[in-house]
């Protein structure tokens, strides 16, 4: 059977949602003495990247600018040690907004509920789209999808203080192609107060796992490395 | 204080339609969605629809989607429904309510088809 | 489409009497459960929201509370004025659904 290295991370830096005309940078990362890095657009090759030196750094970061419609869609990378290949790395969807309108967000009851109620966000948009998206702030890879003619429903809940912070909607003309995104509705979740300490509030930075992490390798990783092998050997 | 002012009565013919008011007063209109509610004589309570003034999201029951049209004039902080169509089932009072919870109410219109 | 059937239609008691009137949901409603009054004259007046928070202004012999799928309104010690109609309301999922009423009658 042929021989290949461990799949790469595909990652999208800040964010997978990127306004239409501004940069894209997609993060490939493989591992210390790649040579070449390949980014491919729904199968096809679209760029390559060459570290320098390839030995002393585990990936590479790809720009894409004047990000448009037929720029969006499913991205992979693979990269290549020697003349061994790697596995492809898993798919990443890469998204454009500020496409046409900007569509309303409006939460039932009410922005202010208490934990236990059942709560359900209504997206309006009224040009032609049939999609529409929900997204809590810090937390958008968890999209909710609902479909309608010019809005959509969101039902949630019964809800508890997990479910706090602000949520924003989208109208999508194709699953890569996204509206402006509407004013954010911050839902306000109260009672629930042996949990209230343990909800994690929302943070206002990007995902988490929306961050490069490329680093590139310097004489202390190779010491720490030996200490760390020496000890491991010592604690045998 | 949180008001919502309906007219008393209107009386309307069988098949012509009526638009029903609601005058709201005393809280940020824009901010807090506005129901409508069925009641026939002697029966009980019926959810007809709701609006959010802040960007005309609407919905409806089922049953209520070709009878009623629910509007808003947020320069004047009112909120409106048209019955069309009206046959004597229509003849009941309706009140609007307001904020997700229905947490006010108004007086209710008594909409009377008769010929 | 939520049912909500509520108990009893009817009901007499005293003065001072303690009653309880019961809705059940046909499908979970979390806490979003009302409890309206409706006077004689039409008016109509919210006394709890989210099953158990009562309104301002209303009296604290009004109480809401829930067991699994029964939400219940009990009165501890029934006034003159409170022998009107009592109506509940869920407001979970729409089409948003009321319970058939109570008619509260004195003996």
């Known amino acids: 059977p042929k021989q290949t290295l461990p799949k790469p991370i595909i990652r999208a830096e800040s964010t997978y949602m990127v306004p239409k005309e501004k940069q894209a940078t997609l993060c490939c990362q493989g591992s210390y003495g790649a040579v070449e890095y390949q980014l491919h657009f729904e199968g096809s090759l679209f760029a390559v990247e060459r570290p320098k030196p390839p030995e002393r750094i585990n990936g590479v970061k790809f720009h894409i600018p004047d990000m448009n419609s037929r720029k969006a869609g499913r991205y992979s990378c693979i990269y290549r040690v020697g003349e061994l290949w790697s596995e492809r790395s898993d798919l990443l969807d890469l998204v454009v907004t500020e496409m046409y309108d900007t569509p309303t967000l409006s939460v039932h009851p009410g922005p202010e509920v208490t934990s236990g109620e059942k709560v359900t966000f209504y997206c309006r948009l009224d040009t032609a789209t049939s999609m529409f998206l929900l997204l809590k702030e810090g937390r958008s890879r968890d999209v909710q999808r609902s479909y309608g003619k010019v809005q959509a429903e969101f039902p949630m809940g019964p809800v508890t203080t997990a479910h706090r912070g602000s949520y924003r909607c989208f109208g999508s003309y194709n699953n890569y192609a996204w509206s402006f995104p509407s004013e954010p509705v911050k839902l306000l979740v109260t009672g629930d107060i042996e949990n209230t300490s343990l909800a994690p509030t929302d943070p206002t930075f990007p995902d988490s796992w929306d961050t490069c992490l490329l680093t590139r390798e310097t004489g202390l990783q190779k010491d720490l490395a030996l200490w760390d092998h020496t000890a491991q050997n010592l604690l045998r | 204080q949180v008001q919502l002012q309906q007219p008393g009565s209107e009386l309307v013919r069988p098949g012509a339609s009526v638009k029903l008011s609601c005058k709201a007063s005393?809280?940020?209109?824009?901010?807090?969605?506005m129901h409508w509610v069925k009641q026939r004589p002697g029966q009980g309570l019926e959810w007809i629809g709701t609006?959010?003034?802040?960007?005309?999201?609407?919905n409806y029951d089922e049953k209520f989607k070709n009878k009623a049209t629910l509007t808003v004039d947020t320069s004047s902080s009112t909120a409106y429904m048209q019955l069309s169509s009206l046959t004597s089932e229509d003849s009941a009072v309706y009140y609007c309510?307001?904020?997700?919870?229905?947490?006010?109410w108004g007086q209710g219109t008594l909409v009377t088809v008769s010929a | 489409e939520i049912q909500m059937t509520q108990s009893p239609s009817s009901l007499s008691a005293s003065l001072g009497e303690r009653v309880s009137l019961t809705c059940r949901a046909s499908?979970?409603?979390?806490?979003?459960l009302n409890w309206l009054q409706q006077e004689p004259d039409g008016t109509i007046k919210r006394l709890i929201y989210?099953?158990?928070s009562l309104d301002s202004g209303v009296p604290k012999r009004f109480s809401g509370s829930r067991s699994g799928s029964d939400y219940s309104l009990t009165i501890s010690s029934l006034e003159s004025e409170d022998f009107v109609d009592y109506y509940c309301?869920?407001?979970?999922?729409?089409?948003?659904?009321f319970g058939g009423g109570t008619k509260l009658e004195i003996k």
């Open positions: 309301l869920q407001y979970a999922s729409s089409p948003y659904t």
């Open positions: 005393g809280y940020t209109f824009t901010s807090y969605w």
């Open positions: 609006i959010y003034p802040g960007s005309d999201i609407t």
């Open positions: 309510t307001r904020d997700g919870r229905f947490a006010n």
């Open positions: 989210a099953t158990s």
């Open positions: 499908q979970d409603i979390g806490s979003s």
